[in-house]
């Protein structure tokens, strides 16, 4: 992926739009489309001042780990959907899109250097508090977390990283 493609705001906005679309679709289905189990996902809440005041290395860890956890969660839901006959096929399309989107975002962030920043210097990773997580038991909640993660931590991190790259 071109190193700074993620710095074009339209790129991230496209993924955010896809995530919101999926969230809206799943809001309409019975019980938010139950997954039948609890899937661990990153907590997407942001104390804005705390985020802005903590170091970039810590942000990188949070975003990189969060993205990995979300990717695992989406793959797990994909597997659960494949084994379910109750859920409409259109949902499968949204999950597939999200899986593909998370792969692309991971590549885009790797190109931006988030992976390097997340592991070096080592003290950044060790001093970072363990990633806060929550449980998602419906597709609706999973897509909401996905959408919030992109709109919140991911967008904040890429904004900072892209600004640093401009200097």
């Amino acid at each position: 992926a071109p190193a700074r493609l993620i710095c074009d705001s339209r790129v991230l906005e496209r993924y955010i739009l896809e995530a919101k679309e999926a969230e809206n679709v799943t809001m309409g289905c019975a019980e938010g489309c139950s997954l039948g189990e609890n899937i661990t996902v990153p907590d997407t809440k942001v104390n804005f001042h705390h985020w802005k005041k903590s170091e970039a290395g810590r942000h990188a860890v949070e975003v990189w780990q969060g993205l990995a956890l979300l990717s695992e969660a989406m793959l797990r839901s994909q597997a659960l959907l494949a084994n379910s006959s109750q859920l409409p096929e259109t949902l499968q399309v949204h999950v597939d899109k999200a899986v593909s989107g998370l792969r692309s975002l991971t590549s885009l962030l790797r190109a931006l250097g988030v992976q390097k920043e997340a592991v070096s210097p080592p003290e950044a990773a060790s001093s970072a508090a363990p990633l806060r997580t929550v449980a998602a038991d419906t597709l609706c909640k999973l897509f909401r977390i996905y959408s919030n993660f992109l709109r919140g931590k991911l967008k904040l991190y890429t904004g900072e990283a892209c600004r640093r790259g401009d200097r």
Epitope: K45, V46, N47, F48, K52, N148
Partner: antibody, heavy 117, light 108 residues
Framework: EVQLVQSGAEVKKPGESLKISCKGS????????IGWVRQMPGKGLEWMGW????????RYSPSFQGQVTISADKSISTAYLQWSSLKASDTAMYYC??????????WGQGTLVTVSS | SYVLTQPPSVSVAPGKTARITCSGD??????AYWYQQKPGQAPVLVIY???KRPSGIPERFSGSNSGNTATLTISRVEAGDEADYYC??????????FGGGTKLTVLG
């Protein structure tokens, strides 16, 4: 002890300009942001904006963007809120507050601004 | 822009539990903050990050936040708790939004 001391009450005429101040002491001024909050007579709190004195980053509430200017002088640990042309509807109590991970954890005593012809 | 809605007033007898609610679209996805303001005074932060208490705030004050609603709970209410209470939240963009405020009246 953390203290935010605001400038005194002001009585102004419509169309006049004004700059009120908020001086921080008892803490590292550049390690925290300063937020400004409006409270019109008998009404609730309205967030106007915040400034990071260290990076000079400012964010305005959409409702106040273009209506006021927020600034800071870190050399004297002071934040400012100013108007270029006051309106009668700007009559209110204006509070500054320190913004930390515990947002708006310390407040100034407030500056009452009265705009009347 | 994001809107937080609070009931204009809540009444409670001394010694009882007061619950003040704050609702906003998917508020549970954001941190909630609560402030107490007594007449003629500046506001005071009583709860931050949904449920944490700043030092000096009594344990009687607690907070929760899920779905579309954040709740400030004041147990064993005292006459001195009578005040206006405001909820607030950070948006992902860095805006800080206050609710309209709730007047807590302690009866008797």
């Amino acid at each position: 002890e953390v203290q935010l001391v605001q400038s005194g009450a002001e009585v102004k005429k419509p169309g006049e300009s004004l700059k009120i101040s908020c001086k921080g002491s008892g803490y590292s001024f550049t390690s925290y942001w300063i937020g400004w909050v409006r409270q019109m007579p008998g009404k609730g709190l309205e967030w106007m904006g915040w400034i990071d004195p260290y990076r000079s980053e400012i964010r305005y509430s959409p409702s106040f963007q273009g209506q006021v200017t927020i600034s800071a002088d870190k050399s004297i640990s002071t934040a400012y809120l100013q108007w270029s042309s006051l309106k009668a509807s700007d009559t209110a109590m204006y509070y500054c507050a320190r913004v930390s991970s515990e947002p708006f954890d310390s407040w100034g005593q407030g500056t009452l601004v009265t705009v009347s012809s | 822009s994001y809107v937080l809605t609070q009931p204009p007033s809540v009444s409670v007898a001394p010694g009882k539990t007061a619950r003040i609610t704050c609702s906003g679209d998917k508020l549970g996805d954001h941190y909630a903050y609560w402030y107490q303001q007594k007449p003629g005074q500046a506001p005071v932060l009583v709860i931050y990050d949904d449920s944490k208490r700043p030092s000096g705030i009594p344990e009687r004050f607690s907070g929760s936040n899920s779905g579309n609603t954040a709740t400030l709970t004041i147990s064993r209410v005292e006459a001195g708790d009578e005040a206006d209470y405001y909820c607030a939240t950070w948006t992902f963009e860095g805006d800080y939004v206050f609710g309209g405020g709730t007047k807590l009246t302690v009866l008797g």
